[in-house]
């Protein structure tokens, strides 16, 4: 059973992940460059279901494509280089989902823009955090 300390740690990690995703979204929304409009032409794959921490596997699998798109922003809208930002997110995701169980991600049929993708995972984080508090 999860202890209060492990729950608190999970909550903090989710809050950190949430802030990172929100920072990316804000950076994109503030970005004045032809690359922003081009960013919207990139497809992201969405989870069929995202209600548990194990479903973060679906986010992990899309981090490389996310990094590629963020590289278009030439980093000036982000405090960190996309590579470092995605690396930080990857560390948190791995800790949150755990590496013991292998979960095969199931994707929804419809793909999403980067904005829709980030909003989906922001909502996921907020939802899980709310169940922990």
């Amino acid at each position: 059973a999860p202890t209060s300390s492990s729950t608190k740690k999970t909550q903090l990690q989710l809050e950190h992940l949430l802030l990172d995703l929100q920072m990316i979204l804000n950076g994109i929304n503030n970005y004045k460059n032809p690359k922003l409009t081009r960013m919207l032409t990139f497809k992201f794959y969405m989870p069929k279901k995202a209600t548990e921490l194990k479903h973060l596997q679906c986010l992990e699998e899309e981090l490389k494509p996310l990094e590629e798109v963020l590289n278009l922003a030439q980093s000036k809208n982000f405090h960190l280089r996309p590579r470092d930002l995605i690396s930080n997110i990857n560390v948190i995701v791995l800790e949150l989902k755990g590496s013991e169980t292998t979960f095969m991600c199931e994707y929804a049929d419809e793909t999403a823009t980067i904005v829709e993708f980030l909003n989906r995972w922001i909502t996921f984080c907020q939802s899980i955090i709310s169940t922990l508090t």
Epitope: K32, N33, P34, K35, T37, R38, M39, L40, T41, F42, K43, P65, V69, L72, E110, T111, T113
Partner: antibody, heavy 116, light 108 residues
Framework: EVQLVQSGAEVKKPGESLKISCKGS????????IGWVRQMPGKGLEWMGI????????RYSPSFQGQVTISADKSINTAYLQWSSLKASDTAIYYC?????????WGQGTLVTVSS | SYELTQPPSVSVSPGQTARITCSGD??????AYWYQQKSGQAPVLVIY???KRPSGIPERFSGSSSGTMATLTISGAQVEDEADYYC???????????FGGGTKLTVL
Amino acid sequence: EVQLVQSGAEVKKPGESLKISCKGSGYNFTTYWIGWVRQMPGKGLEWMGIIYPGDSDTRYSPSFQGQVTISADKSINTAYLQWSSLKASDTAIYYCARDTGYFDYWGQGTLVTVSS
Amino acid sequence: SYELTQPPSVSVSPGQTARITCSGDALPRKFAYWYQQKSGQAPVLVIYEDRKRPSGIPERFSGSSSGTMATLTISGAQVEDEADYYCYSTDRSGDHVVFGGGTKLTVL
């Protein structure tokens, strides 16, 4: 209602210069990219380049770099496409379009004919 | 340079389903957009982000994408759908915008 209204048809001789226009209305002209697309007689659509009227940041297709100049005057919500020395092969319809990652609204097109 | 490949022409009888394909190596990760251009007119967006239909576009127009192929489907094609159709996307980097060569749809 979003509208892009282009200048009228032009008939020119090779070597002459030309500047055609595209006036936007019904939206914040300065915060959307405007693209230019060429369609030669009986042919398909070709992307030429884009401009951000807010600060005139411009990007060109490699095929059109150095061949044309794209500019804008945000004070009158107008984008321009110009040639310093026209060639017969520039004969085409030129469209401007609002770029939101794709072209959602288009002008009616400007027919440019270059003939001696 | 990146290319999008379309068939030059597609013919259907009125009421039949017309399918126009567009292939490109980057399409697994890039959205496809579709434009209709009737003779002497400016292009009109009929499908964006693979499958979304702008307001005012009839329901018979739909889009799908799988792997390197995007498809525009016109279910129950009508005579007024006769036009040139162009797919549009960007290369892997997102830097270069590309139109397909266009497909002439004949409804006879």
